[in-house]
Interface confidence: medium
């Protein structure tokens, strides 16, 4: 049974029963804020093998291991993420180990495991076998490995049962718990998954399979699932859906919106059944299931309830996909992340107008603002204290604003402020004054010549 579109279990642990028949959760799974410690031993969901988005656990009292709950969870696809993360385990007071011994693949996104005072068996898991970019993982504030004294199966009897891999030049046994090894496939399988008996799965399988070299025996699919088979692409007259399966036109036409929302129904575009036309396209009728190219960027007005939209991750930027006019203020605060600019450009690259102010602060992951590649007007209808409509503070790696030879940006009202951007040359800021029409608006201290560009090789600004 496919469950979804996202399951939120909070306050009452008995809600877990909602997962009873789920084999795939199409969407996210949240388990959170269960303050009364319960006996979870009677709760076991062996049918669940795949979560298509992300898994989040937060403050669930009494839960000691996830392995008992989800013994067969094999793949978290990360089709949509929680702040760049596909697995989040945060402030789980009683969790002793993760224990997801069948988890073989996190297809997209990183993991965040933080402030779990009793959590061990973290250094014994080789996350590089499960996900691609371990550098984005955030594992902080858990029980220290010294206190944990993690022992993989068989170690005490000096008959280790688990395999070894190297992490940061430390070659060690890999396991999830004191009695569960981390599964590794034979090197002969290459990138393919394998069965429990180490036979290589069909190339279209992901995570694991019940029989070797059989595309109908996969636990999860590398690409798409259709009618019992894992396929590299959806067959004719079927469409990709939610990043993992193929559906027909009738199915797509009759999907109720998860949010009840204002959407005019799902559309079929470029072989995919999706909630809205992608950027650059617009429906050819308010009832239409099909998209046609826009003349220029498609107009889309986006508004934030709170007036100010904080962009602190790829996930929060995702909410702005397709927006051309943002009614409100943009606060960009991207502290970490690799190659984040291209993701931000995907989601924010069509914004042409911001009606309020733009503030970029503590965004150490940013080298340039060129991801806002179509921004042409900051109206400054709302300004920061001190009448600033463009505010750039403490961005340790910011070197370039935009390519001013190919950029026409006006700031209709308000001043600019720049401070503590050590790699941003003052000449670049002065150039922005010229282009945006703000020259003469700034007060003396608004562009600090001492702490902007002091760690860059800038041409002398005389």
């Amino acid at each position: 049974e496919i469950c979804g579109p996202g399951i939120d279990i909070r306050n009452d642990f008995q809600q877990l029963k909602r997962l009873e028949n789920c084999t795939v959760i199409e969407g996210f799974l949240h388990i959170l804020l269960i303050s009364k410690a319960e006996d979870y031993r009677n709760y076991r969901f062996p049918k669940l093998t795949v979560i298509t988005e992300y898994l989040l656990l937060f403050r669930v009292a009494g839960l000691e291991s996830l392995g008992d709950l989800f013994p067969n969870l094999t793949v978290i696809r990360g089709w949509k993420l929680f702040y760049n993360y596909a697995l989040v385990i945060f402030e789980m007071t009683n969790l002793k180990d993760i224990g997801l011994y069948n988890l073989r693949n996190i297809t997209r996104g990183a993991i965040r495991i933080e402030k779990n005072a009793d959590l061990c068996y973290l250094s014994t898991v080789d996350w590089s076998l499960i996900l691609d970019a371990v550098s984005n993982n955030y594992i902080v504030g858990n029980k220290s490995p010294k206190e944990c004294g993690d022992m993989c199966p068989g170690t005490l009897e000096e008959k280790p049962l688990c395999e070894k891999t190297a992490i940061n030049n430390e070659y060690n046994y890999r396991c999830w718990t004191t009695n569960r090894c981390q599964k590794m496939c034979p090197s002969a399988c290459g990138k393919r998954a394998c069965t429990e008996n180490n036979e290589c799965c069909h190339p279209e399988c992901l995570g694991s399979c019940h029989a070797p070299d059989d595309d109908t025996a996969c636990v999860a699919c590398r690409h798409y699932y259709f009618s019992g088979v894992c396929v590299p692409a959806c067959p004719p007259n079927t469409y990709r859906f939610e990043g993992w399966r193929c559906v027909d036109r009738d199915f797509c036409a009759n999907i109720p919106n998860a949010d009840g929302g204002d959407s005019e129904g799902f559309v079929i575009h470029d072989g995919e059944c999706m909630q809205e036309c992608p950027s650059g396209f617009i429906r050819n009728g308010s009832q239409s299931m099909f998209c046609i190219p826009c003349e220029g960027p498609c107009p889309k007005v986006c508004e934030e309830d709170k007036k100010t939209k904080t962009i602190d991750s790829v996930n929060s930027a995702q909410m702005l996909q397709g927006c051309t006019i943002f009614k409100g203020n943009l606060l960009i605060n991207i502290r970490r992340g690799n190659n984040i600019a291209s993701e931000l450009e995907n989601f924010m690259g069509l914004i042409e107008v911001v009606t309020g102010y733009v503030k970029i602060s503590h965004s150490h992951a940013l080298v340039s603002l060129s991801f806002l590649k179509n921004l042409r007007q900051i109206l400054g209808e709302e300004q920061l204290e001190g009448n600033y409509s463009f505010y750039v503070l403490d961005n340790q790696n910011l070197q370039q604003l935009w390519d001013w030879d190919h950029r026409n940006l006006t700031i209709k009202a308000g001043k600019m402020y720049f401070a503590f951007n050590p790699k941003l040359c003052v000449s670049e800021i002065y150039r922005m004054e010229d282009v945006t029409g703000t020259k003469g608006r700034q007060s003396k201290g608004d562009i600090n010549t001492r702490n902007n560009g002091e760690r860059a090789s800038c041409e002398s600004d005389i």
Partner: antibody, heavy 117, light 107 residues
Framework: QIQLQQPGAELVKPGASVKLSCKAP????????MHWVKQRPGQGLEWIGE????????NYNEKFKSKATLTVDKSSSTAYMQLSSLTSEDSAVYYC??????????WGQGTLVTVSA | DIQMNQSPSSLSASLGDTITITCRAS??????LSWCQQKPGNIPKLLIY???NLHTGVPSRFSGSGSGTDFTLTISSLQPEDIATYYC?????????FGGGTKLEIK
């Protein structure tokens, strides 16, 4: 807040044409399909057609295809409906309205068209 | 064209009553049905969209249900300001079509 501004009334002679306007101030204009609805005095509602202000794509009710022409002027955020070869059957209130989940969420005040010699 | 059969065409009820108006489509329209209210001399006003979603600012005594071909609008605890004509509208396929309306009066 979305507002749709329509003139109150138009008096036209039989056989003539009339161009009704619907002004949608603000940024919202190109983001919504603009629909037109007819209501004869004491009668129900009839959908005439819709236009997409961003690219001028239009879809008509077959019944009104030869009667109504829908256009937009993006620069003034205004939608227009021209009604041609008017007869007494065309005397009605004409509303412009924009959608939400394929329902009509925001309505203009309507323009009363009276066809009379 | 999809026909929308609305019943009853008129209805008289007392203040505080719960009333139900039904709309039947001539073919499956999934959940693409909305309800609007038109008070005498006023413009129509959206109440419910997508069969059961309450439009912003509409009192919670209004509710909608149904899918496929049969839909209902329920008004619980009838108020004097609910005197109006109520229309259903299908948005499944072109042309959009309205029901004939239900005129609600207070006894």
């Amino acid at each position: 807040q979305i507002q749709l501004q329509q003139p109150g009334a138009e008096l036209v002679k039989p056989g003539a044409s009339v161009k009704l306007s619907c002004k949608a101030p603000g940024y919202t204009f190109t983001s919504y399909w603009m629909h037109w609805v007819k209501q004869r005095p004491g009668q129900g509602l009839e959908w005439i057609g819709e236009t997409n202000p961003s690219n001028s794509v239009t879809n008509y009710n077959e019944k009104f295809k030869s009667k109504a022409t829908l256009t937009v002027d993006k620069s003034s955020s205004t939608a227009y409906m021209q009604l041609s070869s008017l007869t007494s059957e065309d005397s009605a209130v004409y509303y412009c309205t924009i959608g939400r989940g394929r329902g009509f969420a925001y309505w203009g005040q309507g323009t009363l068209v009276t066809v009379s010699a | 064209d999809i026909q929308m059969n609305q019943s009853p065409s008129s209805l008289s009820a007392s203040l505080g009553d719960t009333i139900t108006i039904t709309c039947r489509a001539s073919q499956n329209i999934n959940f693409w049905l909305s309800w609007c209210q038109q008070k005498p001399g006023n413009i129509p006003k959206l109440l419910i969209y997508k069969a059961s979603n309450l439009h912003t600012g509409v009192p919670s005594r209004f509710s909608g249900s149904g899918s496929g071909t049969d839909f209902t609008l329920t008004i619980s605890s009838l108020q004097p300001e609910d005197i109006a004509t109520y229309y259903c509208l299908q948005g499944q396929s072109y042309p959009y079509t309205f029901g004939g309306g239900t005129k609600l009066e207070i006894k």
